[in-house]
């Protein structure tokens, strides 16, 4: 018995409007009704809680109203997109899926996605 | 899927010692990492040790008197503690993390990669 697995991309360039998206697919070793999906970021050996949503298999994932994420899920994977990310947030965005019902508990991590950040140039002034 | 039992726990003298246990079934311990953590009343549940194939963590306020050994032939894991002091009281666990290639001596043990929490073992220090 080893560890639930899940599968993220290794790398993802977020948009010049600082929205990034990648999709977390878990391997669900049972049928499990009630998900748990947090989405961490390792960067400068400090890990930080980035969101987290529990959701009922088959209906929509609700992150909290001033998160920065919003998803959707489709059976065992979960299309994420966090938004307003700028330079400094560039790290290493880890998929933490959970099990939660119907027991077994099952836990799996995935293996980061490496979200690169470009602040956009500011606009140069315009005489028109 | 994994299921941790912890023991061991109880009323021990300052200056004493006690060893926890975290005993796990339904799988091998060999792809996860380890950890103890503990809550003090009123506080954030925090980091203790945690172990891994080849490496172990520490917090500062336990170096030196904590100790992390694991036995993965009888599935088990240990939390030796020597030299305990009064803040040393507390509730705690023991959970598991899968083990991932971007683990490092400080992130190893950050209590959001774990779960399979278990349910707790009160140590109290006092004399």
């Known amino acids: 018995c080893k560890a639930m697995h899940v599968a993220q991309p290794a790398v993802v360039l977020a948009s010049s409007r600082g929205i990034a998206s990648f999709v977390c697919e878990y391997a669900s070793p049972g049928k499990a009704t009630e998900v748990r999906v947090t989405v961490l970021r390792q960067a400068d050996s400090q890990v930080t809680e980035v969101c987290a949503a529990t959701y009922m298999m088959g209906n929509e994932l609700t992150f909290l109203d001033d998160s920065i994420c919003t998803g959707t899920s489709s059976g065992n994977q979960v299309n994420l997109t966090i938004q307003g990310l700028r330079a400094m947030d560039t790290g290493l965005y880890i998929c933490k899926v959970e099990l939660m019902y119907p027991p077994p508990y099952y836990l799996g991590i995935g293996n980061g996605t490496q979200i690169y950040v470009i602040d956009p140039e500011p606009c140069p002034d315009s005489d028109f | 899927e994994v299921q941790l039992v912890e023991s061991g726990g109880g009323l021990v003298q300052p200056g004493g010692s006690l060893r926890l246990s975290c005993a796990a079934s339904?799988?091998?311990?060999?792809?996860?990492?380890i950890g103890w953590f503990r809550q003090a009343p009123g506080k954030e549940r925090e980091t203790v040790a945690c172990i891994n194939r080849s490496r172990t963590s520490y917090a500062d306020s336990v170096k030196g008197r904590f100790t992390i050994s694991r036995d993965n032939a009888k599935n088990m894991v240990y939390l030796q503690m020597n030299s305990l002091r009064a803040e040393d009281t507390a509730v705690y666990y023991c959970?598991?993390?899968?083990?991932?290639?971007?683990?490092?001596?400080?992130?190893?043990?950050?209590?959001?990669?774990?779960?399979?929490w278990t349910q707790g073992t009160q140590v109290t220090v006092s004399s």
């Open positions: 339904g799988s091998t311990l060999d792809p996860f990492v």
């Open positions: 959970a598991a993390s899968p083990d991932k290639p971007f683990y490092t001596d400080q992130t190893m043990c950050n209590k959001h990669y774990y779960g399979y």
